[in-house]
Each structure stands twice: as structure tokens, then as C-alpha cells.
């Protein structure tokens, strides 16, 4: 039950995170005009990964796409790439995790396959979250660098006489959405990996302890009976589901391929 809950929660958290990453990537407010100590402009500027927008005092807003690929800063291209990779990995992870969910039955899919898929989706979510966090952080660093450069030189001279307004930009809403969404996707991925450990079938070589009670023998294995059909049915090397609880014996059992998580 705990595994199902962990897996389900991991999926939901990741889903929210990836939706957030998509939203952040599409948002126009990656950087917004800094209004503090700036020349007071009658227009408000904000920029995204794909276009820049200007809101006039009337509220009329006009956006222009970056209709160039080669003319854009390499850092912006890198941020775009990181966000897109994050979205793609997250989307694939979501697809995989849907089939991995314990509450969804697809044919006669074994728990081992579900465990594999849960781990795969978990890793994908973790990488997706890291991509988003990295992308947003790179952009934020770019903003901070540019902010202090333009603060040092609020007006750039043109031809010695004419001045152009040096607009300073600060963190936009998309950065915070991106950080939170990346974090959620990362947490969701970790939860999926934790759930995978619970789903993982254990190749356990149990030593049966024999108790003599009223003339007939009953093999008893503490902790291992949860998924068994009877008290005496787990004396052989059978695959059992232990719901995440681990006994001292199990800790010393042969390592499963899922135990490295």
C-alpha cells in the first residue's frame, strides 16, 4: 500500500512539475524590466525565451518573436535546449510511469517489469528536473551579470552625444515557476525511485526456521508472509512482495538489480 501511495504521489508530483516546466518555458516573463532606480519609462518591458514584450501605459501589450536563430546569445540557446530536453524527458517519463503505476493493470505485466519502468521514469524525472533547474539558473546568472553591467553604466553613449536608455532586467515570474517546477519534478523522480525499491522482486534465499508445535512442522519466516499464500509456501526461493519492509535476513540477501537506487 505504501509503495502504491509513494508511486502515485511521485507520479502526481512529477506531473505537476512537468506541467510547470512547460508553463515556464512558454512564459514571456523570464526577465522583467527593473523599475527600481531606472529611468521611468512609459512602457514596461519583459522577455521570454521565444519573444520579448512591451506593455504600454494603456495596458496595450505587443510581443515580437526572436525571428533569428544565429543572432541569439549562446546562453539563451543553451537555456532553450535545457528546457526542451527537460520537457521531452519528463513527457517520456510520464508516459512510462503511467504503465508502471501499480494501480493500473496492463495484461499480465509482472512486478519486475513495473519496477523497471518505475525506476526508468524516476530517473527521467530526476534528469528532467535537473535540466529545468539548470536552465533557469543559467538564465538567472545571465540576468545578474547583465544587471550589474548595466548598473555600472546606466546609459550607454552613442557617438559621444546621443544617449540610449539602458533598460535593466530582473528576475521574472517564469524563473520562480521554473525553479519550483524543476524541484517538484526532481522530488517526484526520487519518490518514483523509492517506490521502485518496494516494487522490486527480491531473489531472497531464506533460511526457514522450524518450530515444532503439536506434532506437525510449520515453517515460519518473519516478515515474509505478507504476499504469500500460506505460512509454509515461502520456504523455497520464491519471489515475494514485501511492501517495502525489510527484515535483517533480507538485508543480507543477494543484491537485486534494483538495490543500487
Amino acid at each position: 500500500m505504501a509503495v502504491t501511495a509513494c508511486q502515485g504521489l511521485g507520479f502526481v508530483v512529477s506531473l505537476i512539475g512537468i506541467a510547470g516546466i512547460i508553463a515556464a518555458t512558454c512564459m514571456d516573463q523570464w526577465s522583467t524590466q527593473d523599475l527600481y532606480n531606472n529611468p521611468v519609462t512609459a512602457v514596461f518591458n519583459y522577455q521570454g525565451l521565444w519573444r520579448s514584450c512591451v506593455r504600454e501605459s494603456s495596458g496595450f501589450t505587443e510581443c515580437r518573436g526572436y525571428f533569428t536563430l544565429l543572432g541569439l546569445p549562446a546562453m539563451l540557446q543553451a537555456v532553450r535546449a535545457l528546457m526542451i530536453v527537460g520537457i521531452v524527458l519528463g513527457a517520456i517519463g510520464l508516459l512510462v510511469s503511467i504503465f508502471a503505476l501499480k494501480c493500473i493493470r496492463i495484461g499480465s505485466m509482472e512486478d519486475s517489469a513495473k519496477a523497471n519502468m518505475t525506476l526508468t521514469s524516476g530517473i527521467m524525472f530526476i534528469v528532467s528536473g535537473l535540466c529545468a533547474i539548470a536552465g533557469v539558473s543559467v538564465f538567472a546568472n545571465m540576468l545578474v551579470t547583465n544587471f550589474w553591467m548595466s548598473t555600472a553604466n546606466m546609459y550607454t553613449g552613442m557617438g559621444g552625444m546621443v544617449q540610449t536608455v539602458q533598460t535593466r532586467y530582473t528576475f521574472g515570474a517564469a524563473l520562480f515557476v521554473g525553479w519550483v517546477a524543476g524541484g517538484l519534478t526532481l522530488i517526484g523522480g526520487v519518490m518514483m525511485c523509492i517506490a521502485c525499491r518496494g516494487l522490486a522482486p527480491e531473489e531472497t534465499n531464506y533460511k526457514a526456521v522450524s518450530y515444532h508445535a503439536s506434532g506437525h512442522s510449520v515453517a515460519y519466516k518473519p516478515g515474509g508472509f505478507k504476499a504469500s499464500t500460506g505460512f509454509g509456501s515461502n520456504t523455497k526461493n520464491k519471489k515475494i512482495y514485501d511492501g517495502g519492509a525489510r527484515t535483517e535476513d533480507e538485508v543480507q540477501s543477494y543484491p537485486s538489480k534494483h538495490d543500487y537506487v
Epitope: 521611468v40 520579448s52 494603456s58 495596458g59 496595450f60
Partner: antibody
Framework: EVQLVESGGGLVQPGGSLRLSCAVS????????MHWVRQAPGKGLEWVAY????????YYADSVKGRFTVSRDNAKNSLYLQMNSLRAEDTAVYYC????????????WGQGTLVTVSS | DIVMTQSPDSLAVSLGERVTMNCKSS????????????LTWYQQKPGQPPKLLIY???TRESGVPDRFSGSGSGTDFTLTISSVQAEDVAVYYC?????????FGQGTKLEIK
Amino acid sequence: EVQLVESGGGLVQPGGSLRLSCAVSGFTFSSFGMHWVRQAPGKGLEWVAYISSGTTNIYYADSVKGRFTVSRDNAKNSLYLQMNSLRAEDTAVYYCVRSGYYGNSLDYWGQGTLVTVSS
Amino acid sequence: DIVMTQSPDSLAVSLGERVTMNCKSSQSLFQSGNQRNYLTWYQQKPGQPPKLLIYWASTRESGVPDRFSGSGSGTDFTLTISSVQAEDVAVYYCQNVYIYPLTFGQGTKLEIK
């Protein structure tokens, strides 16, 4: 039809105060920013003040900062300019102007009200 | 503050003639975010309030005759009347609508010879 009608102008002594009003009709007043622009007799135009539709942004010309206060009452469709510590150089025709939807332009102007500061 | 300088101060032309007047700002009025120039032109006829002619440096206000056109970018702007009519006698003002305070040029007076 958009109409802006200024009132409250007149003769005032230096150091005195005056409150100009602008009654508007023909458009949704609460959706538009408003300006005050003045024109001294025989001179050019001088922008005085701006107030945004929701009064969040208010800006003044350096020459009137600290002396003039712009305000609005969206319920009454009215714009106001409170002028204190008036000087001779404040003598002008004061126009109430609507801020246009595009390009921050000043698209509709009232006929103006004359303020004369003289002893 | 942005200083707007118009030239010439006045000009007298014959009817049907083409006329151009200039406006220069001390700072660029170009907004890279939307590729717009925040400069506006007004016409003020004697005894009347000003009337909006052109915004965004080159966009004609609705109802303005197409003989009026605006051009320029950054700091240098021009208002052109392709064929002057008698009713065009007025003072023409340019205005910075980019940075507060929103400054006007001193005006260019157009007269008919």
C-alpha cells in the same frame, strides 16, 4: 462622442491655490490613463502630470513636482489637478488629455481652462 | 529629462508643395522589445487644442489625411506633408512618449506663402 471639459481656472495670486476639474464622457473613464498638459500664452506645450487608470502610477513634470497633485474619481468620471504654491510661470491654459490606447499617445484633448497667476 | 528639438522653428510654403519638418531627441526613443519608436506628432491650429496626428513615429491616427506621414528612428524623426493644403496651417509638435517626463518639442509653425 469623447468629451473632456475642464473647469476651475481663473485668476489667483502668487502662492495661492487652485483646483482644476475635468469632467469626461463618451468613453470608459476608468480604463484610461489621463494627463494634464499646459500651454503658456503664445508658447509651446508643456506636459504637467499623468495618472494611470487605477491611480497606481502618477508622474509629474519637474517644474510642478511637490506643488501639484493629480487625482481622479472613476465613479464620478472626473480628473483633478490640485495646484498649490502657484507662481507667475504657472500661468497657462491647462488641458485635460486622455492617454490613447496605442503608442502612449495623447489622443483626446479638452478645450482647456485658463489659469492666471498674478498679483 | 529628454530634450526634444524641432527644426525649423517656422516655414512658409506654397499650396500643394511638399514639406518636411524635423524632430531630434537627446535620447533614443526606440524600444527594442517591440521595435517601436515612442514619438508622437500633434497639430495645433490657432485657437484650438492640439490634435493627434501620428504615434509610434509613423502610424497615422484614424481620420488623419494620408498626406501626413511620419518617419525616422532612434533620435531623428521627420513629419512630412506631401501636398500642403490651406487647412494645414498650424503649429506642429513632436513629443517623447517613452520616458517621463513626457517632453514636447518647441514646435514648428507652418504658414502658407
